[in-house]
């Protein structure tokens, strides 16, 4: 009976047994609902939508990291339907800590304002002085890890979202 | 029973406007991905738009020959579908359809269509 | 786009023969993405095969699919008066999603 299906399964009626719902490709995502023993009439995969991709099976289609804005970092190379962006290196005036845990956006540019000083990616872009560089407020005094939270927010989603 | 009922077809003068709306019931319409397809008289079937659901942010997709010109909405709480027509054209003359997304993209249910005839 | 070709434009059959239309992609098209619609004069299409090969609900069984690629194809193996109607297949491969010109099949 289809109460014992699993999640990724619906009821056949025709054999009696539960059946694996249809999987996804690469670039799509499940359509509808299927699993627990139920599968929608109109169930299947869609592609996904501009700026998401999926590896498929039963995955949903997530967001492009942005590399740029949420990283400030480039893009080594940009996403497509089946695979993520791939973050490069920081974006000017901005450097990734070193011996630093990844957090849970991963490798996170931090401003130069707040950098140490002789900071490799920084030097010649006055590392701790008050100069102005994208997307940062001269006269700030947050912390780095408070800097870089104050930038990533205002996003409209996670890099994984 | 799927149900899908265009209306706000007629006669309109070339570069005129035209609202569509496709009234639903029998299933659950917010889940759903929803599209707009045409026929002009004696013709094949044209594609025209499709608006994806609240979990995909409502996003839309066009034909490029419609694009900038017709918009596709959605309003979940009404359950209506519509399509606003601007710059209409001789060449817009067509029954209207509304339809069901299905998985892989087919059409699994349709309406009986509105007549949407540019005219001077 | 991708343009779909259906041949013939017209066909006319007997009942009780079998008969195959075509559908051409300009380019490869996923099969599970080909669909076929019928469509009877002055009447609403409705989904008649989906991805190939797969018989919507009430469709009779002497209605098949098959096509891989940029070749598709409809056959109904034994066709009877109500078939008489338009057939068009739809694909997507990617925006925007295009169907064919139809092929008209009648009975004699």
């Known amino acids: 009976e289809y109460s014992n299906c699993g999640e990724n399964e619906y009821y056949n009626q025709t054999t009696g047994l539960c059946q694996e719902c249809p999987p996804c490709g690469p670039g799509e995502e499940p359509y509808l609902s299927c699993g627990y023993g139920t599968k929608d009439e109109d169930y299947g995969c869609v592609p996904c939508p501009a700026e998401k991709f999926s590896k498929g099976g039963y995955q949903i289609c997530r967001r492009h990291k942005d590399c740029e804005g949420f990283f400030r970092a480039t893009v080594l190379t940009p996403g497509d339907m089946e695979n993520d962006a791939e973050c490069g290196p920081c974006l000017p005036g901005y450097y990734m800590l070193e011996n630093r845990p990844r957090n849970i956006y991963g490798m996170v540019c931090y401003s130069c304002l707040l950098a140490p000083p002789n900071t490799k990616e920084c030097v010649g872009a006055t590392s701790g002085a008050s100069a102005n560089f994208p997307g940062t407020s001269g006269s700030s005094t947050l912390s780095p890890f408070q800097h870089a939270h104050k930038e990533l927010s205002g996003q409209g989603h996670l890099a994984t979202a | 029973e799927v149900k899908l009922e265009e209306s706000g077809g007629g006669l309109v003068q070339p570069g005129g406007s035209l609202s569509l709306s496709c009234a639903t019931s029998g299933f659950p319409f917010s889940d759903y991905y929803m599209t707009w397809i045409r026929q002009p008289p004696g013709k094949a079937l044209e594609w025209l738009a499709l608006i994806r659901n609240k979990a995909n942010g409502y996003t839309t997709e066009d034909s490029p020959s419609v694009k900038g010109r017709f918009i596709i909405s959605r309003d979940d709480s009404q359950r209506i579908l519509y399509l606003q027509m601007n710059a209409l054209r001789d060449e817009d003359s067509a029954t209207y359809y509304c339809?069901?997304?299905?998985?892989?993209?087919?059409?699994?249910?349709w309406g009986q269509g509105t007549l949407v005839t540019v005219s001077a | 786009d991708i343009v779909m070709t259906q041949s013939p434009a017209i066909m006319s059959a007997s009942p009780g023969e079998k008969v195959t239309m075509t559908c051409r992609a300009s380019?490869?098209?996923?099969?599970?993405?080909l669909h076929w619609y019928q469509q009877k004069s002055g009447v609403s299409p409705k989904l008649w095969i989906y991805?190939?090969?797969n018989l919507a609900s009430g469709v009779p069984v002497r209605f098949s699919g098959s096509g891989s690629g940029t070749s598709y194809s409809l056959t109904v193996s034994s066709v009877e008066a109500e078939d008489a109607a338009t057939y068009y297949c739809?694909?997507?491969?990617?925006?925007?999603?295009?169907f064919g010109g139809g092929t008209k099949l009648e009975i004699k």
């Open positions: 739809q694909q997507y491969s990617d925006y925007p999603l295009t």
């Open positions: 380019s490869s098209v996923s099969s599970s993405y």
């Open positions: 339809a069901t997304v299905g998985g892989y993209y087919r059409f699994p249910s």
């Open positions: 991805s190939t090969s």
